[in-house]
Amino acid sequence: KFSKQSWGLENEALIVRCPRQGKPSYTVDWYYSQTNKSIPTQERNRVFASGQLLKFLPAAVADSGIYTCIVRSPTFNRTGYANVTIYKKQSDCNVPDYLMYSTVSGSEKNSKIYCPTIDLYNWTAPLEWFKNCQALQGSRYRAHKSFLVIDNVMTEDAGDYTCKFIHNENGANYSVTATRSFTVKDEQGFSLFPVIGAPAQNEIKEVEIGKNANLTCSACFGKGTQFLAAVLWQLNGTKITDFGEPRIQQEEGQNQSFSNGLACLDMVLRIADVKEEDLLLQYDCLALNLHGLRRHTVRLSRKNPSKECF
């Protein structure tokens, strides 16, 4: 069942997106689930539908309930449900758990706190940010686009952060607040000279002529967030893009973080329709970062067709 929880505070704007996605050209109809009554699209209404979005301008406690959205295309209909809860404003500073968005964690190198759901709204900078209800002041805090950056993060920076912004709809302004917890990871990240896990040095890879082949270059660079780390393939000492053979392409694999915390990168070299001349090339897996560069070389060899038993 495609259902999504949404929540907001009374007298604030709340915009909810249909959990079922479709092309912008598809029509989306919204209904009150209990009554099956259609939600109007006219903007003069306090609650109205606008394509994939359901807008409460502003929200009231009585708006709480389940809303149905149906995405209609020429060939299919998709149904989703938005479970909306509107809460009364708290008189004290504490933000209850049910109003909290997902917790984010940061470290000395990476301390961005994104304002939750803000991309649904028509807002203009700057955002206002609060920590435990206190407005954030000082040069360490920088409101940038839709996120807060904290310089020189310390363990004391952990806490509940609230972003406040104004949504504008046809000239009318509505306030929106959203809160999430921020935790500080006490991780001492470090960077190492690259270590290539695959391929092995001077590896011979067996391939079949006419078939496709994949080579994976995988390397680790240290622990935590890595600055300027990359893996790539070269052919005969030339970058893939400069080599000019459209059959041979590289694409980024997964950024990996293993259970031991090592930060690793993959790059897959895809060779379509392997040809004889591919066996003459030297394939270099390069891993590089600020410390230096390491190279492992692979060559291809022809795989003998498997002899079938009759």
Epitope: Q234, N236, G237, K239, D284, H291, L293, R294, R295, T297
Partner: nanobody, 118 residues
Amino acid sequence: ESGGGSVQAGGSLRLSCAASGYTYSGICMGWFRQAPGKEREGVAAIYTNGEYTYYADSVKGRFTISQDNAKNTVYLQMNSLKPEDTAMYYCAADRNTCGLRGDFYNYWGQGTQVTVSS
């Protein structure tokens, strides 16, 4: 290696180092230096076509490493020289690693002396 010598502070020198026996397939060449009574330190390194270069913080902005693939030669242009740049400069080469750590290099030159007086 060649190009070493004596120079006044603020002057320039250009060191060169030729490697033989390497093909198109990629080589890293680096410059290292060792002053009397001090440990060897990496100065600069370059991989094949100069796309990847590494410099020690102490020489950034003053030294430039470059390569002539056709001649398999690496150059170190040293500008704004300081007395603390005085050392024996060694050229090193390796096929599979590049950077400022000397223990990764398999091939070493004999060295050329650079002396900078104030």
